[in-house]
């Protein structure tokens, strides 16, 4: 791994579990620079593997609301606008970090958690199982 | 919003900035259950809008390594295996939370940061700009 020289101005940690437990400032710094949010926000409808977005809410998690993609069809939309079952619509998933309140219901104590979320769908050639 | 009853066993926060600064346990709980990792890991190659994965490393960020998708083509792969420019390969982007060391180089002090990452690509019908 990469060794980071320690900044002498770092806060001290009196926590016995240091460095397992760290301080996190929840004032989010937003580094997003989506150059055209309007255009990219309609991909879910214009895709050959379109998807719907479902709201998943969990007050014990931060962020409490996550939007999940569910593919609309099992197949993909062809040039005629029909579902073609020779291709498969599949979810593109990403592992993300969230904060889970631990102990439960605590406003200022969390544990990092990895979850797998579906971000959108893509059209793939199927694995061949059935040979004529 | 949802009001969460406070657990009496919560750790106290002596921090003046509470609740802006919280304690986070970095022992990650992995809730991932990819039910078909063997089959789903090759979508980037089997998609009609295939992508390459590029490694982005930043020691001041947690996680320090993030993989970013870049679409291989401007168009989409058709049934003949050729690139069809009547369709567009576009990146599916997601806003994710990461931890940024703050002050820099500190091992136990972070700030939440939102970044936009490209997770994969999907094939979309283009927006018509040119009418014959």
């Amino acid at each position: 791994g990469i060794t980071i020289p320690r900044n002498p101005g770092c806060p001290n940690s009196e926590d016995k579990n240091f460095p397992r437990t760290v301080m996190v400032n929840l004032n989010i710094h937003n580094r997003n620079t989506n150059t055209n949010p309007k255009r990219s926000s309609d991909y879910y409808n214009r895709s050959t593997s379109p998807w719907n977005l479902h709201r998943n809410e969990d007050p014990e998690r931060y962020p409490s609301v996550i939007w999940e993609a569910k593919c609309r069809h099992l197949g993909c939309i062809n040039a005629d606008g029909n579902v073609d079952y020779h291709m498969n619509s599949v979810p593109i998933q990403q592992e993300i970090l969230v904060l889970r309140r631990e102990p439960p219901h605590c406003p200022n104590s969390f544990r990092l958690e990895k979850i797998l979320v579906s971000v959108g769908c893509t059209c793939v050639t199927p694995i061949v199982h059935h040979v004529a | 919003g949802i009001t969460i009853p406070r657990n009496p066993g919560c750790p106290n926060s002596e921090d003046k900035n509470f609740p802006r600064t919280v304690m986070v346990n970095l022992n990650i709980h992995n809730r991932n259950t990819n039910t078909n990792p063997k089959r789903s890991s090759d979508y980037y190659n089997r998609s009609t809008s295939p992508w390459n994965l590029h490694r982005n490393e930043d020691p001041e960020r947690y996680p320090s390594v993030i993989w970013e998708a870049k679409c291989r083509h401007l168009g989409c792969i058709n049934a003949d295996g050729n690139v069809d420019y009547h369709m567009n390969s576009v990146p599916i982007q997601q806003e994710i939370l990461v931890l940024r060391r703050e002050p820099p180089h500190c091992p136990n002090s972070f700030r939440l940061e939102k970044i936009l990452v490209s997770v994969g690509c999907t094939c979309v019908t283009p927006i018509v700009h040119h009418v014959a």
């Epitope: 569910k70 979810p91 199927p126 | 259950t33 990819n34 039910t35 089959r39």
Partner: nanobody, 125 residues
Amino acid sequence: QVQLVESGGGLVQPGGSLRLSCAASGFTLDDDAIGWFRQAPGKEREGVSCISSSDGSTYYADSVKGRFTISRDNAKNTVYLQMNSLKPEDTAVYYCNTCQIYGLGHDAAAPLGSWGQGTQVTVSS
């Protein structure tokens, strides 16, 4: 050759039961999630159930929960779908396929392979 073969369909009265089988040849099901999908006349193909190999997690469509049970026998390289309390709306061609369960609540399934002939299930009095 790599193949998944569905069998066990037939004509059954409402309230009756059937057990569908999906047998794999040419590859082992040990590390694959396998599921059942169906297509009713004039309707889109839809996911019915899927069973993971890794952690045994399962997916069931809301319309079949409590009535259908998916199971696997890796020794026989076969996946089964036990269908009880059948209704006329269960009439469809049933297909098996490798699948992926997804969603934070394991509430969706996607097919990953090509489709076979399927097996016809007709529920009628």
